[in-house]
């Protein structure tokens, strides 16, 4: 019977972690099995930044220093699995640590929403859909924004309702609007850690329409219609 080296369950192990993770946090783990059933001892090789430690028995990997995404991501180290006893044969795999942005970007509108309008006078309450985004990286799911009106005085005229994690609907509460531009402030919260909030403005014009477009004197561009 020829003694064989331990076998890792994966050629490369990958983990993703926020760059502001607390020291001592488990950032990943590796697993190997020995064909002869011997115990395995795990060790790290090439941890030149001194960021990591591995539990020799379980293969769990922990941070032991502040992680800095500016130093370069992914951070790659080798993981060694060695037989305990026997011939002390070993195998090598890799552990890649991908450092994610902290939640440091407030939500904002995903597009330029200038040019929104309703034809005046409104024959029935109207609504429009808008989309929010931020510049953070989102793991397992997309952003999960919540939406509300930016000031209490708007609540007589407008309401905002969430459609999904990135889209919401702005609706008029009545039809008695003047023929002018209204600036509607929307508060968008990202629900992150820490939660960040952005207040954005949606300019909405109530205007006389010609063939479904906002009538403007010569030299003005037509606005985009939403209902």
């Amino acid at each position: 019977d020829v003694n064989e080296a331990p076998q890792f369950s994966q050629h490369v192990f990958q983990a993703k972690v926020s760059e502001d993770v607390a020291i001592g946090t488990k950032v990943g783990n590796v697993t190997a099995k020995d064909p002869e059933g011997l115990d395995i001892s795990y060790s790290l090789r090439g941890d030149t930044r001194g960021w990591l430690k591995i539990d020799h028995v379980t293969g769990e990997i922990f941070s032991v220093a502040p992680l800095d995404r500016e130093a370069g991501s992914p951070y790659r180290v080798q993981v060694v699995a060695t037989e305990v006893g026997g011939s002390s044969l070993s195998s090598v795999s890799e552990f890649h640590l991908i450092l994610m942005d902290v939640n440091d970007n407030p939500p904002r509108l995903a597009k330029d929403y200038t040019g929104l309008f309703f034809c005046h006078p409104l024959s029935a309450p109207g609504s429009l859909i808008f989309e929010a985004t931020d510049d953070d990286q989102h793991l397992f799911r997309g952003p999960h924004f919540t939406f509300s009106l930016g000031s209490g005085s708007l609540q007589n005229d407008w309401e905002v309702s969430k459609i999904n994690g990135t889209h919401a609907r702005l609706s008029t509460r009545h039809t008695e609007f003047e023929e002018r531009e209204y600036v509607v402030l929307i508060r968008i919260n990202d629900g992150g850690r820490p939660p960040l909030e952005g207040i954005v403005s949606l300019p909405v014009t109530f205007c006389s329409c010609v063939e479904g477009s906002c009538f403007r004197p010569a030299g003005h561009k037509h606005h985009h219609h939403h209902h």
């Epitope: 490369v12 030149t48 991501s73 080798q78 793991l139």
Partner: antibody, heavy 119, light 113 residues
């Protein structure tokens, strides 16, 4: 064998958005990153970003942050790339490219999707 | 971001002769953690998608003819076509896959003299 099949050519007006799809087959979809690379006419290659289908983690090139959104539908093994606020400089061929085994070079490429931005 | 600089921009070589393309990185691409160089080479023929030739600076993709070889370490890398064939006329790109964001060289056009 690995195949990446992209959606067809698009013509868009400035300010609009475009959404390109890339359907993968021939491998375990969630085991490999998917990248998006673009190439303007007569120009070189530019990496836009990547998504890991296993957890939907995205990593975007800072140049495109705020304009690009990459999503994945694991039920159909399809990755999507949406680029908003289009301008004429975004006229390019957009490629999806699967990551390599155990690292991040581009081992397999889609056929490319031409996006033309013109008023 | 890591800047990749290729030279020359274009290259005309006789059939059967050696073609050499250089790629210089603004940062060291040799990982002290794994002792690998994270550099790849691609070939792109007119109207086609790029095709991977080399990764980890010197490992050939399966199916790539052995006349293509990659060498170098750290910041200086070379793609060599030992005996140029007609079908090798293309643009060649280097790419670093060491740190996000992944970046490409500007490309080298190889033609037949």
């Amino acid at each position: 064998q690995v195949q990446l099949v992209q959606s067809g050519a698009e013509v868009k007006k400035p300010g609009a958005s475009v959404k390109v799809s890339c359907k993968a087959s021939g491998y375990t979809f969630t085991d490999y990153w998917m990248n998006w690379v673009r190439q303007a006419p007569g120009q070189g290659l530019e990496w836009m970003g990547a998504i890991d289908p296993s957890d939907r983690y995205t990593n975007y090139n800072q140049k495109f942050k705020g304009r690009v959104t990459m999503t994945v539908d694991t039920s159909t093994s399809t990755v999507y790339m949406e680029l908003s606020s289009l301008r004429s400089e975004d006229t390019a061929v957009y490629f999806c490219a699967r990551g390599g085994y155990g690292d991040y070079w581009f081992a397999n490429w889609g056929q490319g999707t031409l996006v033309t931005v013109s008023s | 971001d890591i800047v990749m600089t290729q030279s020359p921009d274009s290259l005309a070589v006789s059939l059967g002769e050696r073609a050499t393309i250089n790629c210089k990185s603004s940062q060291n691409l040799l990982s002290s953690g794994t002792q690998k160089n994270y550099l790849a080479w691609y070939q792109q023929k007119p109207g086609q998608s790029p095709k991977p030739l080399i990764y980890f600076a010197s490992t050939r993709e399966s199916g790539v003819p052995d006349r293509f070889s990659g060498s170098g370490s750290g910041t200086d890398f070379t793609l060599t076509i030992s005996s140029l064939q007609a079908e090798d006329v293309a643009v060649y790109y280097c790419q670093q896959h060491h740190y996000f964001p992944w970046t490409f060289g500007g490309g080298t056009k190889v033609e037949i003299k």
